[in-house]
Interface confidence: low
């Protein structure tokens, strides 16, 4: 279940996970011509003390991790979020049925970190 | 408890929360001369469908929210993370007991968003 999802015991350290997204699954196939989908990926995992170098933690995340250790019910751990995102080019129909080629920023997760 | 912390029922939408951090509480008072602490703040809250404009969501976060709706046990919701961070200046002793004034980047959360 979704609540199980959040239990720390099941989680590994913050990292990038592979995820292919089909535009048909999102219900966008009627306006997106190409591509049919793309490797979006996502970030997930624990940001627990100590934060290792590969977790790309900000200074704030390091501070927050320490505060969380002292006040776990008040301050959450930092969260595992994208640190590098790439664009993709999409060919689609606009509202007037014109075909448009547009670059959409921040669509693909390249790297994750604790924030 | 910490696990209760993560249950969606208790959470409001992603936003900035105020948090003052005392360096003494972190055990850093022996090397940090000034300031004694600072307003670090933190991000917390739900990134649920639909993502409102004030949630500063990336395109990827919008896609991930939709994928989560279809596969809540496989793909998490985007997480609430800092979108704007500020630096603070810290006066501290280095290993040779020299006093150093240094600007530490990404120490203060100015704004949060869904990532």
């Amino acid at each position: 279940s979704a609540s199980d999802y959040n239990s720390s015991e099941l989680k590994t350290a913050c990292r990038k996970h592979e995820l292919y997204v089909s535009f048909q699954d999102l219900g966008w196939q009627d306006w997106i011509i190409a591509p049919k989908g793309y490797a979006a990926n996502y970030c997930d995992g624990e940001c627990s003390f100590p934060l290792n170098a590969h977790m790309n933690a900000t200074n704030h995340a390091i501070v927050q991790t320490l505060v969380h250790l002292m006040n776990p019910e008040y301050v959450p751990k930092p969260c595992c979020a994208p640190t590098k995102l790439n664009a993709i080019s999409v060919l689609y129909f606009d509202d007037n049925s014109n075909v448009i080629l547009k670059k959409y920023r921040n669509m693909v997760v390249r790297a994750c970190g604790c924030h | 408890s910490a696990s209760d912390y993560n249950s969606s029922e208790l959470k409001t939408a992603c936003r900035k929360h105020e948090l003052y951090v005392s360096f003494q509480d972190l055990g850093w008072q022996d090397w940090i001369i000034a300031p004694k602490g600072y307003a670090a703040n933190y991000c917390d809250g739900e990134c649920s469908f639909p993502l409102n404009a004030h949630m500063n969501a990336t395109n990827h976060a919008i896609v991930q929210t939709l994928v989560h709706l279809m596969n809540p046990e496989y793909v998490p919701k985007p997480c609430c993370a800092p979108t704007k961070l500020n630096a603070i200046s810290v006066l501290y002793f280095d290993d040779n007991s020299n006093v150093i004034l240094k600007k530490y980047r990404n120490m203060v959360v100015r704004a949060c968003g869904c990532h």
């Epitope: - | 001369i33 000034a34 002793f93 007991s97 006093v99 150093i100 004034l101």
Partner: nanobody, 117 residues
Framework: EVQLVESGGGLVQAGGSLRLSCAAS????????MAWYRQAPGKQREWVAT??????LYGDSVKGRFTGSRDNAKNTVYLQMNSLKPEDTAVYYC????????????WGQGTQVTVSS
Amino acid sequence: EVQLVESGGGLVQAGGSLRLSCAASGSIRGFVAMAWYRQAPGKQREWVATVTNGGTLYGDSVKGRFTGSRDNAKNTVYLQMNSLKPEDTAVYYCALRQIGASGYDYWGQGTQVTVSS
């Protein structure tokens, strides 16, 4: 033993200026950091500024109005206070921290600053 003596306090009108001095004497080993604090009646002690050989840091309430400096030869630090406001009224203390100390080891007796509107 180290002694700290503040001077320069007084009564001034809002918008005016004062210059506080804090002279340290005694067996000072590596005069590292000297801080200014203030305490208004019924309020907690508030950090104002820290003057060291590495630079000066200021509290948010005085940033841009107060300037800290030091004269190493005289073991003295100064606090130039401009654009004073009634809320700056307090007893101002200086404190000295030496190398390796976990806090400020020595405090002055304080000097009264009163800003009238």
